[in-house]
């Protein structure tokens, strides 16, 4: 807290300008009018105040707006945003995408801070859903943003917003998140032709069920091994050797290198060795000839 002292004669700030960088903290407190600061916030970002000076300016705004800053001030906070706490930000009502962009720009190149996370949360809640423009903006600044959301939060993403998602935005998503996103992607891209559809849906396939993988295997998609390895194990297990061969096309040879890893390992254990041998890859571990395969899960469902 800065002590209340009278402003020295001739030091009263008539405008927010660069000469204020020389003001001691108590001089800033005494000589800068909070209302003047609020109306000229756009200038603050261009002036190289020290962090301690920014603390004083923040304190002045806090006194002027105890219930939270208006958006006209928030939009021009610039570096002062780095001084805000999540508690400060929870008082704000941010509705403009331009304001959001301006503040994310300040934090650009850094990890998502608690302040930024709170800001995004306030913004998205205010909008009611993650619309395409918002998602576009957020993933541009934070490629991992989408995967930081819970499945419940992802359920509010409209299918139309999926067009904004890039493959790298999904890199850190887990299967539960992809389970939510995949049906939305399927809906979003449903009117595209085969090859274009596969290019778009590929990064979401970690949430695809068996029947969709079977359908893809009929379309000459040539799925790469990296994508195959991210598929749900329970979705891959029912696929036949012929279906996997069609699904992977020329990439089927890559199965040998992955035979010890899931889902390939578990899938091999479910196939007849005879069928695996038709691939000519030397895959081992399938069911020997003459053995009967009982699907216990089906048996349990019937009883």
């Amino acid at each position: 807290e800065v002590e209340k002292t009278a402003c020295p004669s001739g030091k009263k700030a008539r405008e927010i300008d660069e000469s204020l960088i020389f003001y001691k903290k108590w001089e800033l407190e005494a000589c800068v009018d909070a209302a003047l600061l609020a109306t000229q916030m756009d200038r603050v970002n261009a002036i190289p105040f020290t962090y301690e000076q920014l603390d004083v300016l923040k304190h002045k705004l806090d006194e002027l707006y105890p219930q939270g800053y208006p958006e006209s001030v928030i939009q021009h906070l610039g570096y002062l945003f780095l001084k805000m706490s999540p508690e400060d930000i929870r008082k704000w009502n941010v509705t403009s995408l331009e304001t959001l962009k301006a503040l994310l720009e300040v934090n650009k190149g850094h990890e998502m801070s608690p302040q930024v996370a709170t800001l995004i949360d306030r913004f998205v809640k205010g909008r009611g859903q993650l619309d395409k423009d918002t998602l576009d903006t957020l993933t541009a600044f934070y490629p991992g943003y989408l995967c930081s959301l819970s499945p419940e939060e992802l359920s509010s993403v409209p299918p139309s917003s999926i067009w904004a998602v890039r493959p790298q935005d999904l890199d850190t998503c887990d299967p539960r998140q992809l389970d939510v996103l995949y049906p939305k992607a399927r809906l979003a891209f449903q009117n595209m032709n085969g090859s274009e559809y596969f290019v778009k849906i590929q990064s979401f396939l970690g949430g695809a069920p068996t029947e969709d993988l079977k359908a893809l295997s009929q379309q000459n998609v040539s799925m790469d091994l990296a994508t195959f390895m991210k598929l749900r194990t329970d979705a891959v297990l029912p696929l036949t050797v012929a279906e996997v061969q069609k699904l992977l096309g020329p990439h089927v040879e890559g199965l040998k290198a992955e035979e010890r890893h899931r889902p390939v390992r578990d899938w091999i254990l479910r196939q007849r060795q005879d069928d695996l041998d038709t691939l000519g890859l030397g895959l081992q571990g399938g069911i020997p000839n003459g053995y009967l395969v009982l699907d216990l899960s089906m048996q349990e469902a019937l009883s």
Epitope: S19, I21, F22, K24, P48, T50, Y51, E52, Y79
Partner: nanobody
């Protein structure tokens, strides 16, 4: 790397004038701030006058109206014109330049903010 060299100090009578010069070299753009500090025996170094990269000026209360800070961009030189000198102006005067990219320090009135310093020039005012 910025080099800063002061000149112009000396011994004068109270009421007289002096002009200090601060020549900087080693860079093509103006630092964020150039400032004149002074340090009297047994006292802390204090800001006398400051000049921003845009030409805005600042003066400490003790010299306001008597001292003028200015610069000549062509010569990369900052001046401190000192008029109506008083006995209490006696000190070593230092020129400082600062770029402060990480905004450390308390304010630009604090010597800790400046990266580049001259060796100082002695100003003695006799009464």
């Amino acid at each position: 790397e910025v080099q800063v060299v002061e000149s112009g100090g000396g011994l004068v009578q109270a009421g007289a004038s002096l002009r200090l010069s601060c020549a900087s070299s080693g860079r093509t753009i103006s630092p964020i701030a150039m400032a004149w500090f002074r340090q009297a025996p047994g006292k802390e170094r204090e800001l006398v006058a400051g000049l921003t990269w845009t030409g805005r000026t600042y003066y400490s209360d003790s010299v306001k109206g008597r001292f003028t800070i200015s610069r000549d961009n062509a010569k990369n030189t900052v001046y401190l014109q000192m008029d109506s000198l008083k006995f209490e102006d006696t000190a070593v005067y230092f020129c400082a330049a600062g770029d402060n990219p990480d905004r450390r320090g308390s304010s630009w009135s604090s010597s800790s903010v400046y990266e580049y310093w001259g060796q100082g020039t002695q100003v003695t005012v006799s009464s």
